[in-house]
Interface confidence: medium
């Protein structure tokens, strides 16, 4: 018995191609010896058609090749443009002559079945249903009605009017008549699969007087839509499955060797690899939904499928849509840190990239929530006021034109840990995702404000000082007044930074802010921070309450950053030292926005109708600087 193995019978159709794999034992000699494909003649002779030595017969010219796969111990014969003349007996084998080790293969090429001229062709997508119309003469009205599927030898019953149903069609096939019309019956087959494709015959009556109709059912697999996306960008899969599955659970899965692994579904299942960077959004009552994935990685490339089924899992015979996603590694989106680390009580400055060609676009920052289908409520934006629970500790600084805006979050708690998205109402590919990790603080903060319980008295002078370590010496220090539209930087002269010295006294490094005289509008949150050019660093926040001289009660009411600011900033510095940018968060691209509750995955943030101007990041505010007195000691 030959150790070569292959298919004993191969059946195909005229015009098609076929790939025949032959297996050989794993030896070095076998891997290197000649492989051949020959056709057996009546005399028993086997005429070589193609071999691994480069021989190619005239009848195979331009339509066949033979490829050896020594690592698999297989070789493959590919033959294209098959004709009925290719029907016959062949051998695939190894050896210098065609009498070597071989395996017999029978190839049968059939004609494309010629459909009878009265054949009705139905073309349907996989998962949909078809209603086949079967007309008959009145005299066959009392007779049995049936639909059968043609095989090579016979016609296999699908369903008949005596309620007989083929096991493959149970629950999917219905035979019925409409109204009082006794000249036509219908067969509905639902949840169509590839295997339902083929030729059917519907029949009413028996024998020569029977009415017959030929039906060709073609079941089409959806052509995958090709999607080309950049590394670190985002992709939206828009899935439109139709009204009939509007009430079913929806899913997106990725094709694996033998299954389709669910990435997300509307029943709350989510692949951990996509944590923090995926949302699924039901669009309407017509079975439309979309899935957004941000922060695309190289390994996200592949074949995706969306579908609907009550289980939230892929199911044969249910409608699907498919995509082939390619991830281009030469990305225009900058490579930023995807994880930012902060400590409790501290702050993080997150640099969000956006398309530099769209500097006037609205910028947003939202927090990804994994519950339900996932959503991303906007926390702050250039025209979106800061959410109440982030009062005094969150601001967005837009730096026009340089392709980056900064989001600063201070007074961190462990509850701030999670995933956040940077997004704009412009180029949706630039949605980026950042994971914020917050650890318990183990040392004093770098920036410290005194006094800590700040209550200013109306009409008097009030000074707060911000102490900073020597490592921030060469960085620009600033105070800003926070409002829910941003943190308005208060003008200052940074004269201390221009002084030269040889030592740094840790205790004397401070930048002070003086309110003189204190007015009611001065009440609110103030931040002390450091930055280098447009790169923001650490911040710390303090709430200044304003009271009457009588020391009456005060209420918290953060005011507009553009109110009269009567500020003196003083800085005592005695050294230049190496600048250290701590907690400089540089995110890795991820996802998206719209409305306060960003649930319409593909929709852009221009729908965010929250009003108000963004706080200025560079002192170009509307406040009058003539009211500011700068005291430098």
């Amino acid at each position: 018995k030959s150790p070569i193995f292959g298919p004993q019978e191969v059946s195909s159709i005229e015009g098609d191609s076929v790939s025949i794999t032959c297996y050989y034992p794993d030896t070095s000699v076998n891997r290197h010896t000649r492989k051949y494909w020959c056709r057996q003649g009546a005399s028993g002779m086997c005429t070589t058609l193609i071999s691994s030595n480069g021989y190619l017969s005239k009848e195979y010219s331009g339509r066949a090749n033979l490829i050896n796969f020594p690592e698999n111990n297989t070789f493959v014969i590919n033959i294209e443009q098959l004709t009925q003349d290719d029907t016959g007996s062949y051998k695939c084998g190894l050896g210098t002559s065609n009498r070597g080790l071989s395996f017999d293969v029978s190839l049968e090429v059939s004609q494309v079945p010629e459909l009878p001229s009265d054949t009705h062709v139905y073309t349907k997508d996989i998962g949909r249903n078809v209603t086949i119309e079967c007309p008959f003469k009145r005299e066959n009205a009392p007779s049995k009605k049936s639909l059968c599927k043609k095989t090579n030898q016979s016609c296999e019953l699908v369903i008949d009017s005596t309620e007989k149903v083929n096991p493959s069609y149970i629950g999917r096939a219905k035979l019925f008549m409409k109204g009082t019309d006794l000249t036509v019956f219908y067969v509905n087959i639902s949840h169509l699969t590839h295997n339902d494709a083929g030729l059917y015959i519907c029949q009413a009556g028996e024998g020569p007087s029977a009415d017959k109709k030929n039906v060709d059912l073609q079941v089409l697999a959806p052509e995958p839509e090709l999607l080309y996306k950049d590394l670190r960008s985002s992709v939206t899969f828009e899935c439109d499955l139709g009204r009939e599955v509007a009430n079913e659970a929806k899913y997106l899965c990725r094709m694996n060797k033998e299954t389709c692994d669910v990435i997300i579904n509307t029943l709350g299942k989510r692949d951990p690899d996509f944590e923090g960077r995926i949302l699924i959004t039901p669009k309407d009552d017509n079975g439309r939904f979309s899935v957004l994935i941000t922060g695309l990685r190289k390994e996200d490339a592949g074949h995706y499928q969306c579908g609907a089924h009550s289980s939230g899992l892929p199911q044969e015979g249910w409608p699907i849509q498919t995509w082939q996603l390619f991830v281009n590694e030469e990305s225009t989106i900058p490579n930023r840190r995807s994880v930012v680390k902060g400590v409790t009580g501290g702050s993080v400055a997150i640099a969000c990239p956006y398309n530099p060609k769209e500097s006037s676009s609205l910028k947003y920052w939202c927090r990804w929530e994994g519950d339900g289908n996932g959503h991303c409520p906007v926390l702050v934006g250039t025209q979106a006021q800061v959410q109440e629970e982030y009062e005094g500790r969150l601001a967005l600084f837009d730096q026009p034109g340089n392709g980056t805006y900064t989001v600063i979050l201070n007074q961190l708690t462990t509850e701030d840990a999670g995933f956040y998205w940077c997004l704009t109402n412009g180029d949706s590919r630039w949605r980026t995702t950042i994971e914020l990790q917050v650890a318990e603080a183990t040392r004093e903060p770098n920036l410290e404000v005194t006094p800590q319980n700040a209550t200013a008295v109306l009409g008097e002078t009030f000074t707060v000082s911000c102490h900073y370590p020597c490592k921030f010496y060469s960085q620009e220090k600033y105070w800003c007044k926070w409002s829910n539209k941003g943190c308005h930087i208060l003008p200052s002269h940074d004269e201390g930074a221009r002084q030269s010295s040889v030592s740094c006294d840790q205790s004397s490094q401070l930048v002070s802010m003086t309110l003189n005289p204190v007015s009611k509008e001065d009440e609110g949150w103030y931040w002390c921070g450091v930055k280098q050019g447009q790169t923001y660093g650490e911040t710390t926040a303090i709430y200044i309450a304003v009271e009457e001289r009588t020391r009456g009660s005060s209420h918290v009411n953060p005011t507009d950053a553009n109110a009269r600011a009567k500020v003196a900033l003083e800085e005592e510095v005695v050294d230049s030292s190496i600048s250290e940018k701590e907690n400089k968060a540089i995110p890795n691209p991820g996802p998206f926005a719209n409305e306060r509750e960003i649930q319409n995955v593909g929709d852009q943030a221009q729908e965010n109708r929250a009003s108000g101007d963004a706080g200025s990041a560079d002192g170009q505010s509307r406040s009058s600087s003539s009211k500011h007195h700068h005291h430098h000691h």
Epitope: E9, S11, I20, E258
Partner: nanobody, 126 residues
Framework: EVQLVESGGRLVQAGGSLRLSCAAS????????MGWFRQAPGKEREFVAT??????????YRAEDVKGRFTISSGAAKTTVWLDMDALNPEDTAVYYC?????????????????WGQGTLVTVSS
């Protein structure tokens, strides 16, 4: 999830015939392989026969020692596969398993098949 249900196994006299049937549900693609393996008491599971559909072509594979006696065929819907066994002998006694898989490369390797039935017992008495 793909499910395979075998039937048809029973006690048969040597020289007799038997038809095993395997019905599949959940096969979501048009290209797959579906066939039969058997395992005799105390022996390894061995390949019997397989049908493979790939890009419009159909491939039939059979083990050398069953050629001429066993025939594998399928229903029109490709979801049922039959194994017709003639000239049975006591060495054919085994549990016969139906197997299916997508992208099956090495048809004789059990590890290439992802889905298996529970098995049906065929006993051939002398």
């Amino acid at each position: 999830e793909v499910q395979l249900v075998e039937s048809g196994g029973r006690l048969v006299q040597a020289g007799g015939s038997l038809r095993l049937s395997c019905a599949a549900s959940g096969l979501t693609r048009s290209d797959y392989a579906m066939g039969w393996f058997r395992q005799a008491p105390g022996k390894e599971r061995e390949f019997v026969a397989t049908l493979k559909w790939s890009e419009g072509s159909r491939f039939m594979y059979r083990a050398e020692d069953v050629k001429g006696r066993f025939t594998i065929s399928s229903g029109a819907a490709k979801t049922t596969v039959w194994l017709d066994m003639d000239a049975l002998n006591p060495e054919d006694t085994a549990v016969y398993y139906c197997a299916a898989g997508f992208n099956v490369g090495f048809v004789r390797r059990a590890s290439e098949y992802n889905f298996w039935g529970q098995g049906t017992l065929v006993t051939v008495s002398s």
